[in-house]
């Protein structure tokens, strides 16, 4: 049976130029943590394997960062950057967990952030 | 220019354990992954195993847990494969493969291996 | 484990027409799929990498598509020299699966 549960930043906006961190923590469960993939919509753009390490996906080296932890970094965001993100957890043995944040990239240097979630 | 160079074919007996070489160059041997590909004669391509250089991590395809171990020597920039308790079914050749990513952009020439008594 | 299902199996075109392979992955691996060209007697070679990138110095007669679960791969007008068995493979998650692989050959 999945017990987990994923928390998310949830809903989040940025400036247009600036940076964003995108994070989810997987709870509730003592499933091993496999590996976490990152996508945008319908593009992988980051993984994270428990083995090997991050791998970032050469069309996104540019302006993706790994991490914080098991999280993401966007940079010089743009308009275009505005969708759903999903954290996509392979753990062992319960099976895969998703998280989904909403990010806004916003023209206007008054960007309000949403509350930030920090992993301890 | 990268290149990677595997060492040369193999006959074993069932039961045998072979260790395959793959030395690569032309680039910084610890910044990206080796995996190892097989090909039975007439079968599909079959992905074993990977090894992260830089930090040593490696993961396994479950049916070859056991049985298998990929090593890397950074000093040499040498990647090993080395696959225990042979049995026929295992007669193929084998690739070493530069991992960008999880897809494989350079291979070695292959190393065939032949599984008889 | 993802399971990759290519279809034809082999597939006879005729010199300039296209040719289509079709990947499917039996679950959800976003745009984690690559396309790899094997000669006989030769190591495999990448085409096409996260679904739609071509792979430096690869022909531009060579295009991929798709996302989830369903990919192609399209040769736009057939070269004698495409002549191979073409393989998708999923670097989604592991292990990194390959599919059955599509025979190309010349009408």
């Known amino acids: 049976m999945m017990t987990g549960t994923i928390e998310t930043t949830g809903n989040i906006s940025a400036e247009k130029g600036g940076s964003i961190i995108l994070q989810c923590h997987l709870s509730s469960t003592t499933a091993q943590v496999t590996q976490v993939n990152w996508e945008q919509q319908d593009q992988l753009l980051a993984i994270c394997n428990a083995d090997l390490g991050w791998h970032i996906s050469p069309s996104f080296k540019d302006r993706v960062a790994p991490g914080p932890g098991l999280g993401l970094t966007l940079q010089s965001l743009t308009v275009n950057d505005t969708g759903e993100y999903f954290c996509i957890y392979h753990t062992y043995p319960d099976g895969t967990y998703t998280g989904r944040i909403f990010l806004e990239v916003l023209e206007s240097s008054v960007a309000e952030h949403g509350a930030r979630f920090q992993i301890p | 220019e990268v290149q990677l160079v595997q060492s040369g074919a193999e006959v074993k007996k069932p039961g045998a354990s072979v260790k395959v070489s793959c030395k690569a160059s032309g680039y910084a041997f610890t910044n990206y992954l080796i995996e190892w590909v097989r090909q039975a004669p007439g079968q599909r391509l079959e992905w074993m195993g990977v090894i992260n250089p830089g930090s040593g991590g490696t993961n396994y395809k479950e049916k070859f847990k056991g049985r298998v171990t990929i090593t890397a020597d950074k000093s040499s920039s040498t990647a090993y494969m080395e696959l225990s308790s042979l049995r026929s079914e295992d007669t193929a050749v084998y690739y070493c493969a530069r991992g960008e990513y999880f897809f494989f952009d350079y291979w070695g020439q292959g190393t065939t291996v032949t599984v008889s008594s | 484990d993802i399971v990759m299902t290519q279809s034809p199996d082999s597939l006879a075109v005729s010199l300039g027409e296209r040719a289509t392979i079709n990947c499917k992955a039996s679950?959800?691996?976003?745009?984690?799929v690559a396309w790899y060209q094997h000669k006989p007697g030769q190591s495999p070679k990448l085409l096409i990498y996260?679904?739609?990138y071509r792979y430096t110095g690869v022909p531009d007669r060579f295009s991929g598509s798709g996302s989830g679960t369903d990919f192609t791969l399209t040769i736009s007008s057939l070269q004698a020299e495409d002549v191979a068995v073409y393989y998708c493979?999923?670097?989604?998650?592991?292990?990194?699966?390959f599919g059955g692989g599509t025979k190309v050959e010349i009408k």
């Open positions: 493979q999923q670097h989604y998650n592991t292990p990194h699966t």
């Open positions: 996260s679904a739609s």
């Open positions: 679950q959800h691996v976003s745009t984690g």
